[in-house]
Structure formats: structure tokens, C-alpha cells
Amino acid sequence: MGARRLRVRSQRSRDSSVPTQCNQTECFDPLVRNCVSCELFHTPDTGHTSSLEPGTALQPQEGS
């Protein structure tokens, strides 16, 4: 399964025209229309922590 190009969506509430800015440890969750705590990943092949890259199986920092 190849990597897909991410379709970047506006970080806006469906009932608001004001974009939501989140701090570094957060990201925008469209479901709750707000900034939430966001985890980074360790990729299995490198062990590096990064933002999510499409098309890869990933290992969260905090084990499940």
C-alpha cells in the first residue's frame, strides 16, 4: 500500500470562520472542533519520533 498525498484541510470549526491555532503539544481534532493533546510516533524501522507520515505502520510513543 503506497503512501498517499495528504489532502490538507482547513482547521476550522464547521460553525466558525476563525481558524484554530494549537500549541506545539496539541493538534486540531475536527471531531470535537478543538485543540487536543497529540502524541508523536516512533517509526518501527528507525525509532525516530515524528509526525504521522501516510502509508506506514507506526508505533506510538506510549505503548498500548
Partner: antibody, heavy 125, light 107 residues
Framework: EVQLVESGGGLVQPGGSLRLSCAAS????????IHWVRQAPGKGLEWVAW????????DYADSVKGRFTISADTSKNTAYLQMNSLRAEDTAVYYC??????????????????WGQGTLVTVSS | DIQMTQSPSSLSASVGDRVTITCRAS??????VAWYQQKPGKAPKLLIF???FLFSGVPSRFSGSGSGTDFTLTISSLQPEDFATYYC?????????FGQGTKVEIK
């Protein structure tokens, strides 16, 4: 270790009330959204409500709106579901779950990664 | 509300088979789909999130694909422990809605 433990289920008559609790450990509920999902006997999953404790945002399924209230006490790291005016069709196992978010270019990519064991609510006369 | 239509509702398969389950959203939900596995009497388990990302600890025989309105969960080689019910769920907009489920049974 992340854990969610529900309690408060039981047998109640139609029109009655119950309060379910979801005690979290291993993470802080204020950093995530907490969801209640139910499953009637032999049926599929039905989302009920969510709360974002950090700001108090909530939302509800149409089937429970006006009857159920979701809340959270961050000092107790616990979420609640107050269920009033219960009906036979509310009979189900009720699960609480945490929504995890991973950073996908500033936007949440996630799902419900931890679930409680479930608590059975039976509405019957 | 966004409707998630899963198909088939049930299927019979043998160990080693390739199994595909589809989920169709009533409107564009980008890639905001998760897939869950549930066994009788147990809570659901997260398999795939954001349409194609394998959750931690999930075997690589599970994969997900799709975007927009059409999504697929594939089990490349069915194992005995994979006989269960599978659900898709959208989280693009509240309320988050589940598909009706697909029961994978032993042939």
C-alpha cells in the same frame, strides 16, 4: 498502564435514572475526549456522547439528547454519564473509551484506543 | 448525521483466506475512518485509524485504505483469532458514527 473502569450499571425501571462512572488511570482525561458507546444485546455499536474535559465541550446522539448528560471531574480523573427518563431501548452494555490523537500535520489522526470492560444497563419493569 | 454503510453484514471464510470489508460514508469524510475488531463479550479493539494507519500491536496482515467516501479493511491471510465482528467508524464530524458491523465466521 492506561485503564478505564466503568461502574454504576444495573436494573432500573422505565422512567428511572442511573449514573455511570468511568474512572481513568494511567493518563489525564483533561488531555483527551472521553466517549460513551453502547451495545444493545445482539446489536452493533452505537455512539452515545462525548466530553472534552479541558473545555467542557459535549455532544450527544439524537437518541439520548435531553435525557442523558455527560460530564467529567478532572480532579477525580473520572467521566460520568447521567441517564434520566430511561427507556427499554436504552438497555445495553455501556462502554467508555478514550480517543487518542496522533499528529498528522497539525490535525488529529486517531481512534478510540482504550475501552473499559463495559457495564450492563437493563431497563425493565 | 453521516451514515456509514458496511458490507457485507456477514461472511464465511477459511483460515488463510484474504478477506475484504468495505465501508461507505454518506458524504466526504477525508480519511477520518477507524476500524475496530470485537469478540463476543469483549470491548472493541482499535485496528486501523485515519483510514490506513496500523495501530500499535496490530498484526501487519491487517490493512486499511480509502479516502473520501469509500474505505476498505483487508485481512491478507485470515488467522483463527481473526474470527470476530468488525466495525468502521467516522470521526470527521460529530456525531461519530459506526457502521453496522461485519461478522467474519468460519466456513
Amino acid at each position: 498502564e492506561v485503564q478505564l473502569v466503568e461502574s454504576g450499571g444495573g436494573l432500573v425501571q422505565p422512567g428511572g435514572s442511573l449514573r455511570l462512572s468511568c474512572a481513568a488511570s494511567g493518563f489525564t482525561i483533561s488531555s483527551s475526549s472521553i466517549h460513551w458507546v453502547r451495545q444493545a444485546p445482539g446489536k452493533g455499536l452505537e455512539w452515545v456522547a462525548w466530553v472534552l474535559p479541558s473545555v467542557g465541550f459535549t455532544d450527544y446522539a439524537d437518541s439520548v439528547k435531553g435525557r442523558f448528560t455527560i460530564s467529567a471531574d478532572t480532579s477525580k480523573n473520572t467521566a460520568y454519564l447521567q441517564m434520566n427518563s430511561l427507556r427499554a431501548e436504552d438497555t445495553a452494555v455501556y462502554y467508555c473509551a478514550r480517543r487518542v490523537c496522533y499528529n498528522r500535520l497539525g490535525v488529529c489522526a486517531g481512534g478510540m484506543d482504550y475501552w473499559g470492560q463495559g457495564t450492563l444497563v437493563t431497563v425493565s419493569s | 448525521d453521516i451514515q456509514m454503510t458496511q458490507s457485507p453484514s456477514s461472511l464465511s471464510a477459511s483460515v488463510g483466506d484474504r478477506v475484504t470489508i468495505t465501508c461507505r460514508a454518506s458524504e466526504d469524510i477525508s480519511s477520518s475512518v477507524a476500524w475496530y475488531q470485537q469478540k463476543p463479550g469483549k470491548a472493541p479493539k482499535l485496528l486501523i485509524f485515519s483510514a490506513s494507519f496500523l495501530f500499535s500491536g496490530v498484526p501487519s496482515r491487517f490493512s486499511g485504505s480509502g479516502s473520501g467516501t469509500d474505505f476498505t479493511l483487508t485481512i491478507s491471510s485470515l488467522q483463527p483469532e481473526d474470527f470476530a465482528t468488525y466495525y468502521c467508524q467516522q470521526s470527521e464530524v460529530s456525531p461519530p458514527t459506526f457502521g453496522q458491523g461485519t461478522k467474519v465466521e468460519i466456513k
